[in-house]
């Protein structure tokens, strides 16, 4: 059929909870393409009816929820004007969550289930929750060794758990839990993470690379809405915190009352050797006080800033 086959990594998932996989393969999916999902080489596409337990939602395949019998190879076919790619995704469903029983539990952990904290540093864990826009995620709860995490060293920030002054006792088995709402129905998502502690300053000496911004200014009109992406590449097993700060404060905290400037939800695309992360900053309305301030994107030890500036007067208007 002239489609080029691409084999993705295996995904190991928990039964009885929602799961979604996005058919993206940059740069193929960056243009105008059609995406169709199939299961186990079936000629019949996955349903697009949102009431179906398994259905296609834009470029995503969505399981509400995943069941034991859903294991298998799924294909998404990406058709462009002059190209066709078939991406194979092997989904393996395990039955039980670790905190309920060790029987039938998750075998051989993949990268998303392993994270590292750096001893003596302020660090973070990430709850990998990847779902289409039709799914609304509630606040995240974090557990360590099957008990809910409480204490002043721990702060929940969107999909991350911030851990200050990491100690050796912070190693162990963590889980993040969120309530997902789709078409009025609620589902529980619970992801396990095994956490190890390292004394090294960074994973394998690797430093995250901020691709954009590049310490530059952006011309923007007063009163307009502005969204700026911070694009970061980092190793697949990194635990670096990615965020926007102003005056050395998280923008969500700095603008806590007005909520005029907010950090977006982080997304990422997985490549063979690295991940590409995107976290945006949204200015609902640019004000005079925003000009000249460096808005910093942080990724681990890496930083880059943007500075807003008023556009130069356009004398042709006079």
């Amino acid at each position: 059929d002239g489609c080029k086959d691409i084999f993705m990594k295996n995904e190991i998932l928990s039964a009885s909870q929602p799961f979604a996989f996005n058919c993206t393969f940059p740069p193929i999916t960056s243009g105008e393409v059609s995406v169709t999902w199939y299961k186990n080489s079936s000629k019949i596409p996955v349903s697009k009816i949102i009431q179906s337990r398994i259905h296609q939602d834009e470029t995503w395949i969505l399981f509400l929820p995943m069941e034991w019998g859903d294991s298998g190879v799924y294909q998404c076919v990406i058709k462009g004007r002059d190209s066709c790619h078939r991406i194979h995704v092997n989904l393996t469903v395990f039955e039980k969550h670790w905190c309920d029983t060790s029987i039938g539990g998750l075998p051989n952990l993949s990268d998303e289930y392993k994270q590292i904290l750096h001893l003596g540093k302020d660090d973070s864990l990430t709850c990998h929750l990847h779902f289409p826009k039709s799914c609304v995620l509630g606040p995240i709860k974090w557990y360590k060794d099957c008990n809910e995490i409480k204490g002043e060293r721990f702060t929940v920030l969107e999909t991350r758990l911030l851990v200050s002054n990491v100690s050796a006792e912070d190693r162990g088995n963590y889980a993040c839990q969120a309530i997902l709402t789709h078409s009025g129905k609620q589902y529980e998502v619970l992801n396990g993470i095994t956490v190890s502690i390292t004394e090294r300053a960074g994973y394998g000496g690797s430093v995250p690379k901020i691709i954009y911004p590049k310490n530059h200014s952006i011309e923007v009109q007063l009163g307009t809405t502005l969204i700026v992406d911070c694009n970061v590449t980092d190793t697949k097993d990194n635990t670096n915190l990615r965020c926007w700060r102003v005056n050395n404060t998280l923008v969500d905290d700095y603008y806590d009352e007005s909520k005029r400037i907010r950090e977006g939800v982080e997304t990422h695309v997985s490549f063979r050797e690295h991940n590409l992360y995107t976290v945006n900053i949204t200015f609902l309305e640019v004000k005079m006080e925003d000009y000249g301030l460096p808005f910093m994107c942080h990724a681990g030890v890496s930083t880059a800033y943007i500075i807003l500036q008023l556009p130069a007067p356009d004398f042709r208007a006079y």
């Epitope: 029987i103 039938g104 539990g105 998750l106 075998p107 051989n108 952990l109 099957c146 095994t194």
Partner: antibody, heavy 119, light 108 residues
Framework: QVQLVQSGAEVKKPGASVKVSCKAS????????MHWAKQAPGQGLEWIGE????????NYNQKFQGRVTMTRDTSISTAYMELSRLRSDDTAVYYC????????????WGQGTLVTVSS | QIVLTQSPGTLSLSPGERATLSCRAS???????LHWYQQKPGQAPRLLIY???SRATGIPDRFSGSGSGTDFTLTISRLEPEDFATYYC?????????FGQGTKLEIK
């Protein structure tokens, strides 16, 4: 290194109870499930149940349900398995074994505790 | 529950020979959840092979495992004197956990 050290041999009368201990060292006790298994003389292995030391959640084999109680004391990294209403066919070596997250198998075992039920 | 049946019950071989031990499950077991243990008299069992074919730490490469679904095999390519023991297969897929009844490997 990881060690699971069990309590010594016990002789009990039918109808009595026995409580076997398993002291863990060399790893974070609260991070792994602890399982118990039975091996009658000259017989194979039989699974009794499991306990998560941090949450105290237990799951028992239906066959032992009602007679077995698993507990733990996290302050001394020790798991306990108590078997009540003992019968002669409970005479066996009882083992504790540990299971790690993402590794659903018994990589570490205690040395075993012989429980003899005799009138 | 999943019943595991091992065969033969006893296997009599000489050092240097090849041993093939079988474990059959009453229903399908994922390869991730089928394991083999070795036990010598008066000792606790020792993990030999996990997830059907992965050797545990310190286990020599003469031990290998294979199989899928309901049929699994433990092979010892060239028997050493210390290999004579009882071998158990075990499933970790569903509760209750079950073991095979064991295969006793004895010196001929």
């Amino acid at each position: 290194q990881v060690q699971l050290v069990q309590s010594g041999a016990e002789v009990k009368k039918p109808g009595a109870s026995v409580k076997v201990s398993c002291k863990a060292s060399g790893y974070t006790f609260t991070s792994s499930w602890m399982h118990w298994a039975k091996q009658a003389p000259g017989q194979g292995l039989e699974w009794i149940g499991e306990i998560h030391p941090n949450s105290a959640k237990t799951n028992y084999n239906q066959k032992f349900q009602g007679r077995v109680t698993m507990t733990r004391d996290t302050s001394i990294s020790t798991a306990y398995m108590e078997l009540s209403r003992l019968r002669s066919d409970d005479t066996a070596v009882y083992y504790c074994a540990r299971v790690d997250y993402g590794k659903p198998w018994f990589a570490y075992w205690g040395q075993g505790t012989l429980v003899t039920v005799s009138s | 529950q999943i019943v595991l049946t091992q065969s033969p019950g006893t296997l009599s071989l000489s050092p240097g020979e090849r041993a093939t031990l079988s474990c059959r499950a009453s229903s399908s077991v994922s390869s991730s959840y089928l394991h083999w243990y070795q036990q010598k008299p008066g000792q606790a069992p020792r993990l030999l092979i996990y997830s059907t074919s992965s050797r545990a730490t310190g286990i020599p490469d003469r031990f290998s495992g294979s199989g899928s679904g309901t049929d699994f095999t433990l092979t010892i390519s060239r028997l050493e004197p210390e290999d004579f023991a009882t071998y158990y297969c075990q499933q970790f897929q569903s509760s209750p956990l079950t073991f095979g009844q064991g295969t006793k490997l004895e010196i001929k």
